[in-house]
């Protein structure tokens, strides 16, 4: 069945979200399972629910078990579960396995930790982070909005990674930790300011009006794996989503790596049916990363 | 009432381009995903592409993908498929649907169908 | 991609006999099953979802059941009208995919 394991420690707070997401609007009742016993929804109650939320402020041990979430629409009912496990803080600094979130890889250029679940929270910046237990100190350890980023990232960076923050509930405060390991990757990869390398600056396309036309936007941003690297299309400075004509799509970046080991993504952009109109627009092809913006333009003309 | 009404099919050359539309009505158009199906004369049912609510989000089967474009204009309660560079093999009957849960990159079922809009590739 | 093979291809039966089709997935799929009808130049209409719900309007003589790769669509009690094309489609990832179809034919 449609399930989720969630877990926490005892005089935590742990907000678990129903594995059967639905949209805002529909009403989502809780039960527990064993005694199918009604969730209360008011707030002073030490376990409550919130719509897709599930708080206990804090945690016990007791709690453990399986929960039902049934998310109602007009004319769906749909039910999940959720498998709760509350653990007894641990004496010692160990963090067992099964307090574990998922793993993650970094980089020398490629160092992000995120904070498991933090997004089920409602808490302020900064976020505290701990590595084997030692608070992590020091100008190579930047904590950016729900993440860890670690500079010149070193084989010896590998390891447990505990961020605790302070959840809040109506003017009460909750502590919460989630440890997740962190592993390093050898990847002698590097990051450029943005190459284009199609289409060429101030280009002119010849199209025929009526027939359909493809327009690609490639550019390179360095070897390995990158931070932040995105290429789009711009009609006269606006986003394509922005402007509403179906018949000129943007697709989705395709990533591109070279026998030289580039890093590169392509986008294209799809005009059907070309019209008059089109050969007044300006096409700006935009690649970013954490260098900077580029931007050629082309044009398109008549046949 | 629920309705979804196709338009746009044809006879096309290979290598032609159409584009379908689908009107609905009844329902909030703009915060449900949209999904076309093809089925082939004689076969069985095929997922072609869907969108999400707000378009932010598209999805294609690999036969279609860099050939087909699903869009849709919520001010005007109306799906469309642009076809490009069609085969032989994309005769069918397409059908468009609606999916009336599905969360951001998730999907459910499809509630409610229009009629379909017969599509005939062939030279 | 999830692969749905359903079995038989062919069901031939009775009004008043009991139907049971059978949907097999390549991986597991939870409980994000669905089963539609098809009749001829109809469009697909949905039955059931989540495996064993009945979607609205659906006579109780349709029944679905299993979790995770085998599923079952039964249908009670055949009625003349339940003679139709029947596709079992998961949703539990893209791309979403149906069966091959079940045809259920009077005998």
């Known amino acids: 069945k449609f399930s989720k394991q969630s877990w926490g420690l005892e005089n935590e707070a742990l907000i678990v979200r129903c594995p059967r997401q639905g949209k805002s609007s529909y009403i989502v009742d809780w039960y527990y399972s064993q005694t199918n016993k009604s969730i209360p929804t008011q707030e002073r109650n030490r376990v409550f629910a919130s719509g897709q939320l599930l708080k206990f402020l804090p945690a016990e041990v007791a709690d453990s078990g399986i929960y039902t979430c049934i998310v109602r629409s007009p004319t769906f009912n749909r039910t999940g579960y959720a498998n709760v496990t509350i653990y007894k803080k641990q004496p010692d600094c160990n963090v067992p396995d099964y307090l574990m979130y998922s793993t993650v890889s970094g980089s020398e250029k490629n160092s992000k930790i995120y904070c498991p679940t933090i997004d089920l929270y409602n808490w302020t910046a900064p976020l505290e982070w701990f590595k084997n237990c030692q608070a992590l100190q020091g100008s190579r350890y930047k904590a950016h909005k729900s993440f860890l980023v670690i500079d010149n990232v070193m084989t010896d960076d590998a390891g447990d990674y505990t961020c605790k923050f302070i959840h809040n509930e109506n003017g009460a405060n909750y502590s919460v930790t989630a440890t997740r390991s962190f592993t390093v990757k050898d990847e002698q990869g590097f990051s450029l300011f943005p190459v284009i390398r199609a289409p060429a600056h101030n280009e002119t396309k010849e199209v025929e009006i009526g027939e359909n036309t493809n327009l690609t936007c490639s550019a390179c941003f360095g070897k390995g794996a990158q931070f932040l690297a995105t290429v789009q299309w711009q009609l006269n400075g606006n986003k394509i989503t922005d402007f509403s004509e179906p018949r000129i799509q943007q697709e989705e970046g395709q990533n591109q790596s070279f026998s030289n080991g580039l890093a590169c993504v392509n986008t294209v952009l799809r005009i059907a049916d070309v019209k008059e109109e089109d050969l007044l627009l300006r096409y700006d092809c935009l690649a970013l990363n954490l260098h900077g913006l580029r931007r050629h333009t082309i044009r398109l003309s008549r046949k | 009432e629920v309705q979804l009404l196709e338009s746009g099919g044809g006879l096309v050359q290979p290598g032609g381009s159409l584009r379908l539309s689908c009107a609905a009505s009844?329902?909030?158009?703009?915060?449900?995903?949209m999904f076309w199906v093809r089925q082939a004369p004689g076969k069985g049912l095929e997922w072609v592409s869907s969108i999400e609510g707000n378009g932010g989000a598209t999805y294609y089967a690999d036969s279609v993908k860099g050939r087909f474009t699903i869009s849709r204009d919520n001010s005007k309660n109306t799906l469309y498929l642009q076809m490009n560079s069609l085969r032989a093999e994309d005769t069918a009957v397409y059908y468009c649907?609606?999916?009336?849960?599905?969360?951001?990159?998730?999907?459910?079922?499809?509630?409610?169908w229009g009629q379909g809009t017969l599509v005939t590739v062939s030279s | 991609e999830i692969v749905l093979t359903q079995s038989p291809a062919t069901l031939s039966l009775s009004p008043g006999e009991r139907a049971t089709l059978s949907c097999r997935a390549s991986q597991s799929v939870d409980d994000d099953l669905a089963w539609y009808q098809q009749k001829p130049g109809q469009a697909p209409r949905l039955l059931i979802y989540d495996a064993s719900n009945r979607a609205t309007g659906i006579p109780a003589r349709f029944s679905g059941s299993g979790s995770g790769t085998d599923f079952t669509l039964t249908i009670s009690s055949l009625e003349p009208e339940d003679f139709a094309v029947y596709y079992c489609q998961q949703y539990i990832g893209a791309p979403i995919t149906f069966g091959q179809g079940t045809k259920v034919e009077i005998k």
């Open positions: 649907a609606r999916d009336p849960w599905s969360t951001e990159g998730s999907f459910f079922v499809l509630d409610y």
């Open positions: 009844g329902f909030t158009f703009s915060v449900d995903s």
